[in-house]
């Protein structure tokens, strides 16, 4: 059999090997595709499949429009003039090349030594579904899953049996100084098909600089609430990336999922202490916040005690 | 919203002519193929003739083939058929209606035109 | 010619009742069948397009299915509505064939 390949929407001929160019013609088509469970004998008088499948003059059958249901294989048994039987047959695949892919949501720079998204490059409209592959400074990047980390999802268009396809890309860039240059490309993994590549972004990689700080701001300011109320207390770092910040409560750690925010809904005589944040940096070790004090007590009560934050409601170090 | 609208039925004698027309609209009409049905009083469903999409391709059952023909204006949205050496079994009300071929089967159906053949 | 069987030709049915109409093929039409619902001096409404599928605007409680050649209609709780008369159709070959037709009826 001989393997074709058709783009969507396109037409395509096949023809029938060993048929009379002209009638009379003994000649017979069958097909087996997405629009069939088994095989369907077209008529050669031509009827309600020729929108999808025609016998033309010729023997010949033309798909005006082929589609994804057109996929499967074509078989046409002729007589030729002197009496012999001829088969042909077609295993028709179809191909839809997408629009050029882009990166969406790239980055502006990257930090040496930790993990950095590039961005996510997406292709939409393709069939098959086809790959996208990474590129730096015009090399493949092979995904290692530590250094290079690629996450990927597909799509299909449940009305256009269409494909898009989105993958991000995270590094970690070793050095700082240098200008890598990313880009993305998309293959339908089709022969004589050249890959779609995106523009290329360059992007900065800057050495990570230690957090400036860290600032612990209470609500209500000056810590000092009633019973019930509610405390929120935010640690506030500049650093990028966001460090994991864990929570000290009169200087034992508390068994919380690392959170930038601590809320205190409800409170009581028991949550009355001193309290810290702990963010810790992958490039520069743990960093704490200076102490707040939060005291309990009825409305009418004195101003801040001693030790407690002061009237802004924060503490920073430098 | 797709519309099928039928027109020019009316009292015929046995031998005579006449010209249906139907106007469609709210479809891309040289998207579809259209197709004529026909009903006689109390009976059930007929297919009368289908048309592919461009004009080029029709199609007839044996009792109407050689006397009617289907055709069709692109540009002005509009379905015809030519009914020539009508009989009296050819009486009904007559619909036009979008489709015909695998793809669509016959999906919206206009309210019909009644041709009567008779002395 | 294909011929499309279409049974029973009538049937009494109440308002709740299940109502099961069937069109048997005299060869194979694959998916390609269409359910329709005629009322009395109205046209054709298209129920169930290539066997199973429900069209735009018709209620849940029409449903198409198909077991190789015999095709089927099932309304799963007949509404004062229902009562009409329905026709199966065949768009596989010419000539487009239809069925005789099942007439509704109140009990």
């Known amino acids: 059999g001989q393997n074709i390949t058709a783009r969507i929407g396109e037409p395509l001929v096949l023809s029938c090997k060993g048929a009379p160019k002209k009638p009379p013609q003994q000649l017979e088509w069958k097909l087996n595709t997405g629009r069939t469970e088994a095989w369907k004998v077209l008529s050669p008088q031509g009827g309600p499949w020729d929108s999808v499948a025609r016998i033309l003059p010729n023997g010949s059958l033309l798909l005006p429009a082929t589609g994804i249901v057109d996929e499967g294989t074509f078989r046409c048994r002729a007589t030729n003039r002197r009496g012999k039987e001829v088969k042909s047959n077609y295993r028709v695949r179809v191909y839809q090349i997408p629009g050029k892919p882009e990166i969406v949501d790239p980055a502006s720079e990257l930090t040496a030594s930790v993990p950095n998204k590039v961005g996510t490059c997406v292709s939409e409209g393709s069939y098959p579904a086809g790959t996208l592959s990474w590129h730096l400074d015009g090399k493949l990047l092979i995904p290692d899953g530590k250094e290079t980390l690629v996450k990927e999802e597909t799509r299909r268009h449940p009305e256009t049996g269409l494909f898009t396809l989105r993958s991000e890309l995270t590094v970690i860039p070793t050095q700082g100084g240098t200008h890598p240059t990313f880009s993305c490309s998309f293959s339908l993994g089709l022969p004589r098909r050249r890959p779609l590549n995106t523009a290329p972004i360059q992007l900065r990689v800057r050495e990570p600089g230690p957090p400036e700080g860290i600032q612990l701001l209470v609500e209500p300011e000056g810590g000092i609430v009633a019973p019930g109320g509610t405390v929120t207390l935010t640690c506030a770092i500049s650093a990028q990336p966001p460090p994991q910040v864990h929570w000290i409560k009169d200087g034992a750690p508390l068994p919380l999922a690392p959170s930038p925010v601590l809320l205190l809904p409800e409170v009581g005589h028991e949550d009355e202490g001193t309290y810290s944040c702990v963010a810790t940096h992958p490039s520069h070790g743990p960093q704490e916040s200076p102490p707040v004090s939060i005291r309990v007590t009825e409305t009418g009560d004195e101003g801040p005690a001693e030790g407690s934050v002061g009237e802004s409601g924060l503490g920073t170090l430098a | 919203e797709v519309q099928l609208v039928e027109s020019g039925g009316g009292l015929v004698q046995p031998g005579g002519s006449l010209r249906l027309s139907c106007a469609a609209s709210?479809?891309?009409?040289?998207?579809?193929?259209m197709t004529w049905v026909r009903q006689a009083p109390g009976k059930g469903l007929e297919w009368v003739a289908s048309?592919?999409?461009?004009?080029?391709?029709?199609y007839y059952p044996d009792s109407v083939k050689d006397r009617f023909t289907i055709s069709r204006d692109n540009a002005k949205n509009s379905l015809y058929l030519k009914m020539n050496s009508l009989r009296a079994e050819d009486t009904a009300v007559y619909y036009c209606?979008?489709?015909?071929?695998?793809?669509?089967?016959?999906?919206?159906w206009g309210q019909g035109t009644l041709v009567t053949v008779s002395s | 010619d294909i011929q499309m069987t279409q049974s029973p030709s009538s049937l009494s049915a109440s308002v709740g009742d299940i109502v099961t109409i069937t069109c048997r093929a005299s060869?194979?039409?694959?998916?390609?069948v269409n359910w329709f619902q005629q009322k009395p001096g109205k046209a054709p409404r298209r129920l169930i397009y290539?066997?199973?599928n429900l069209a735009d605007g018709v209620p849940s409680r029409f449903s198409g299915s198909r077991s190789s050649t015999d095709f089927t209609l099932t309304i799963s709780s007949l509404q004062p509505e229902d009562f009409a008369t329905y026709y199966c159709?065949?768009?596989?070959?010419?000539?487009?064939?239809f069925g005789g037709g099942t007439k509704v009826e109140i009990k």
């Open positions: 209606t979008r489709g015909g071929d695998i793809t669509t089967g016959l999906d919206y």
């Open positions: 709210g479809f891309t009409f040289n998207n579809y193929w």
């Open positions: 048309i592919d999409n461009s004009g080029d391709n029709t």
């Open positions: 060869q194979d039409v694959g998916i390609y």
């Open positions: 290539r066997a199973t």
């Open positions: 159709l065949e768009f596989d070959e010419h000539p487009l064939t």
